[in-house]
């Protein structure tokens, strides 16, 4: 059994999250993950899910009663999601920590927008993306 | 030329982001994107970048002078990043909108944690992930 399982059960008790009523009104993450089989699609969704958990854990960082559980779960998330790669984890953390209300950050983001957009689609690197793919307003 | 380019230039003027000094102290996104060649790694990072831009645009949704530019860029992001798939975009939006301070959301997140963790590594679905792969604490 992976180390996180016991610690996640401990968190369930702490958050009173073991009761069946918690599942009322649908799931947060599991239903969404079920929709996506392609690895790159799953990473798009899991990236948001992992950042949610990191934020949640940060909010409880001063609660000593769950520190060991949180650390063990983060350890295993880093193994599983970041493939034990500190640079990947650090780059991810940098992105999640940028403040959207910081004027300098806003200016930089807009300054980089064209180049970011040019890299967004997988085929962008090979220049193969067709105009016929373009149908969406959102 | 993709439609977003002209509109991004318009945003550069609005945010006063065209000056060379904006690039001082390094990049926000471009340096990080340069580190990752694997498609699944890129999606992890781009997921955070796209959610940043969506939040930024949301903050300026009442500013009529840039509405057309913002809408055009969002449209093109949806084409490029979500491959014109509304369900993918909607699931993504759901994940970005969950409040980490909402007690019901916290309970649900902890309730789902074990299953989310079990799905995090690519090999988890095929049951091939070996114990020997596991090393990381974060």
């Amino acid at each position: 059994q992976d180390p996180y399982v016991k610690e996640a059960e401990n968190l369930k008790k702490y958050f009173n999250a073991g009761h069946s009523d918690v599942a009322d009104n649908g799931t947060l993450f599991l239903g969404i993950l079920k929709n996506w089989k392609e690895e790159s699609d799953r990473k798009i969704m899991q990236s948001q899910i992992v950042s949610f958990y990191f934020k949640l854990f940060k909010n409880f960082k001063d609660d000593q009663s769950i520190q060991k559980s949180v650390e063990t779960i983060k350890e295993d998330m880093n193994v599983k999601f970041f493939n034990s790669n500190k640079k990947k984890r650090d780059d991810f953390e940098k992105l999640t920590n940028y403040s959207v209300t910081d004027l300098n950050v806003q200016r930089k983001a807009i300054h980089e927008l064209i180049q970011v957009m040019a890299e967004l689609s997988p085929a962008a690197k090979t220049g193969k993306r067709k105009r016929s793919q373009m149908l969406f307003r959102g | 030329q993709d439609p977003y380019v002209k509109e991004a230039e318009n945003l550069k003027k609005y945010f006063n982001a065209g000056h060379s000094d904006v690039a001082d102290n390094g990049t926000l996104f471009l340096g990080i994107l340069k580190n990752w060649k694997e498609e699944s790694d890129r999606k992890i990072m781009q997921s955070q970048i796209v959610s940043f831009y969506f939040k930024l645009f949301k903050n300026f949704k009442d500013d009529q002078s840039i509405q057309k530019s913002v809408e055009t860029i969002k449209e093109d992001m949806n084409v490029k990043f979500f491959n014109s798939n509304k369900k993918k975009r909607d699931d993504f939006e759901k994940l970005t909108n969950y409040s980490v301070t909402d007690l019901n959301v916290q309970r649900k997140a902890i309730h789902e944690l074990i299953q989310v963790m079990a799905e995090l590594s690519p090999a988890a679905k095929t049951g091939k992930r070996k114990r020997s792969q596991m090393l990381f604490r974060g």
Epitope: P3, N85, K88 | W36, K37, L135
Partner: antibody
Framework: EVQLLESGGGLVQPGGSLRLSCAAS????????MSWVRQAPGKGLEWVSA????????YYADSVKGRFTISRDNSKNTLYLQMNSLRAEDTAVYYC?????????????WGQGTMVTVSS | NFMLTQPHAVSESPGKTVTISCTGR????????VQWYQQRPDSAPTLIIF?????PSGVPTRLSGSIDTSSNSASLIISSLRTEDEADYYC?????????FGGGTKVTVL
């Protein structure tokens, strides 16, 4: 100050076993990953194995997989390497190293090493 | 498998600058941090650069690290070379399932 002291090296015959220990002090042992690195006489550094702070996650070089086992006892601040089915090519100085944070990354502090000689 | 390649040896006069390269093969060097270690004769290695460019406290500013994505290589730069810089230098990184060392570079101060 971080201190790492390896012990348990010595002369062993091919096919034999040895257990190396590394006593750690000067830091919160359970918060850091630990590694074993070896260096054959006159050769470069070769990473052998690593273990996470909790001990729940282990990692091995292909050359030792299935023969060596890394473990730790956080209550004793001690790291171990159980070496079985030893071969002549395992002859080396074995260093215990503390990771610079709690993951596979950079080896911030090293012990002075213990010599393992595999010979008949 | 990802590999790190270093020159076997470099030599230079005191006061000069030496650059030791560490080239990634079969993978992207920028996708993991690169570290550098110094090993003097009959001593254990010591960390001198971590996370591509960072220096641990106590390491002189004469030593610096860099990454060049275009050549897929990392470099250790030792400026104002001194006799005490004579040692073996190893680059190190990791991939998804192991830690990797380069073969080492012997620096001789002429």
């Amino acid at each position: 100050e971080v201190q790492l002291l390896e012990s348990g090296g010595g002369l062993v015959q091919p096919g034999g076993s040895l257990r190396l220990s590394c006593a750690a002090s000067g830091f919160t042992f359970s918060s850091y990953a630990m590694s074993w690195v070896r260096q054959a006489p006159g050769k470069g550094l070769e990473w052998v194995s690593a273990i996470s702070g909790s001990g729940g996650s282990t990692y091995y070089a292909d050359s030792v997989k299935g023969r060596f086992t890394i473990s730790r006892d956080n209550s004793k601040n001690t790291l171990y390497l159980q070496m079985n089915s030893l071969r002549a090519e395992d002859t080396a100085v074995y260093y215990c190293a503390k990771d610079g944070w709690n993951a596979l990354g950079w080896l911030e502090s090293w012990g002075q090493g213990t010599m393992v000689t595999v010979s008949s | 498998n990802f590999m790190l390649t270093q020159p076997h040896a470099v030599s230079e006069s005191p006061g000069k600058t030496v650059t030791i390269s560490c080239t990634g093969r079969n993978g992207n060097i920028a996708s993991n941090y690169v570290q550098w270690y110094q090993q003097r004769p009959d001593s254990a290695p010591t960390l001198i650069i971590f996370e591509d460019t960072q220096r641990p406290s106590g390491v002189p500013t004469r030593l610096s690290g860099s990454i060049d994505t275009s050549s897929n290589s990392a470099s250790l730069i030792i400026s104002s070379l001194r006799t005490e810089d004579e040692a073996d230098y190893y680059c190190q990184s990791s991939d998804s399932n192991r830690v990797l060392f380069g073969g080492g570079t012997k620096v001789t101060v002429l």
